[in-house]
């Protein structure tokens, strides 16, 4: 199955600079997240500029086809990756300069996604079997967030509406969203 | 904390109607499948019926179709599952359950939030 | 409608045991769901998509299987172990549980 990713110009995207991320949420055991308890860097802006404006977040256009086992989507579902570290929109790729990649020495702020849309697909079955149709939930927008001390980096794919956010720890399956032939191209997403 | 929270314990007679709920907590209940299952007193779990509470699409199991209604309303966030004339034979332990989903570069879908469950006594 | 058959109905072991728990297919499905569910509680995910281990539950509970034979493994039994496991499958209407395999302490 070709597995694309189309990319549009970076959008800027307003960081919440005095916004501290609630913590996902979490089953009773506390392990949806791999938190990290103790230590962390102190919590300062990491931004030199009074400008929020300057900081951008880029949202990338990927297309795919929704799969259980040998079904697949009768249409391809696009949906939003949420790229990369929020940073200067000058210096942003795509963005006018080509300036060099920007990063903060404080706390991260991370795109990651905001809000979500659902939609049901209907599935099609080789040999003429009948699937039924499935709810998927798709990135429908992206936005700067701060990370303070109870997220790392490891977290950064794991942000969004799941309760019970299944356990993947036990196969070494790539965590970014279009971790198939296009992973390289989203190397740096969520 | 997400959750689905159902209604209290319910005792009928038969040929009575009943309805009973299933809130939606913290998430909304239009953008997943909602689905009933029963449990009738130390037996199985038995799927009855899943709605999409985003336009009130419901899929029935056979057994169950035509035996009770699912319905829901998403501005609520509530899914309903109701009969208009109770029998002995509906004692059970109802769950409703949400179906979730993940994505990772393959799809994945699991009944991953459950209610607690609403006990029905059916009797004369 | 896929028929899902569990075997054994009842496991008897101890402690530290293992715990080897079938659910087969009655035609070819893409995966197979495991719940656990002790008495007075809602079920609760184990394993989805045949293989994967749920939020929260200890590796010694793992998953196996294609087409129409599946099994749960539980590697080293522990007290809160003992439980009435379920299969279940979500490819095809209308969906379907196995009957369920109820492990004790023997």
């Known amino acids: 199955q070709g597995w694309q990713a189309f990319k549009n110009d970076a959008t800027e995207i307003i960081p919440e600079l005095g916004e501290y991320p609630e913590p996902p949420p979490e089953l009773e055991n506390n392990k949806t997240m791999n938190r990290a308890e103790n230590g962390g860097r102190p919590p300062h802006h990491p931004f030199e500029t009074k400008d929020v404006s300057e900081y951008s977040c880029r949202e990338l256009h990927f297309t795919r086809y929704v799969t259980d086992g040998q079904c697949r989507s009768a249409k391809p579902v696009t949906e939003l990756v949420c790229s990369g570290q929020c940073g200067p929109a000058r210096l942003l790729p795509n963005a006018i300069g080509r300036g060099k990649w920007w990063r903060p020495s404080g706390p991260d702020f991370r795109c990651i996604p905001d809000r979500y849309r659902a939609q049901r697909v209907q599935l099609l079955c080789p040999g003429g079997a009948a699937p039924r149709a499935r709810k998927v939930r798709l990135v429908a927008s992206c936005k700067c967030k701060r990370l303070t001390r109870f997220h790392n980096q490891s977290e950064l794919k794991d942000f969004g509406p799941e309760a019970a956010r299944p356990q993947k720890g036990r196969k070494p399956r790539p965590r970014a969203r279009g971790a198939k032939a296009n992973q390289a191209e989203l190397e740096n997403a969520y | 904390e997400v959750q689905l929270v159902q209604s209290g314990a319910e005792v009928k007679k038969p040929g009575e109607s009943l309805k009973i709920s299933c809130k939606g907590s913290?998430?909304?209940?239009?953008?997943?499948?909602i689905h009933w299952v029963r449990q009738m007193p130390g037996k199985g779990l038995e799927w009855m019926g899943q709605i999409d509470a985003e336009d009130g699409e419901t899929e029935y199991a056979p057994r169950f179709q035509g035996q009770v209604t699912i319905s829901a309303d998403k501005s609520i966030s509530t899914a309903y599952l109701q009969w208009s004339s109770l029998k002995a034979s509906d004692t059970a332990m109802y769950y409703c359950?949400?179906?979730?989903?993940?994505?990772?570069?393959?799809?994945?879908?699991?009944?991953?939030?459950w209610g607690q469950g609403t006990t029905v006594t059916v009797s004369s | 409608e896929i028929v899902l058959t569990q075997s054994p109905a009842t496991l008897s072991l101890s402690p530290g045991e293992r715990a080897t728990l079938s659910c087969s297919a009655s035609s070819s499905v893409s995966y197979i769901h495991w719940y656990q569910q002790k008495p007075g509680q809602a079920p609760r995910l184990l394993i989805y998509s045949t293989s994967e281990l749920a939020s929260g539950i200890p590796a010694r509970f793992s998953g196996s299987g294609s087409g129409t034979d599946f099994t749960l493994t539980i590697s080293s039994l522990e007290p809160e172990d003992f439980a009435v496991y379920y299969c279940?499958?979500?490819?095809?209407?209308?969906?379907?549980f196995g009957g369920g395999t109820k492990v004790e302490i023997k």
């Open positions: 359950a949400r179906e979730g989903y993940y994505y990772d570069g393959r799809d994945y879908w699991y009944f991953d939030v």
């Open positions: 913290d998430f909304e209940i239009k953008d997943y499948y």
């Open positions: 279940q499958q979500l490819s095809h209407l209308p969906l379907t």
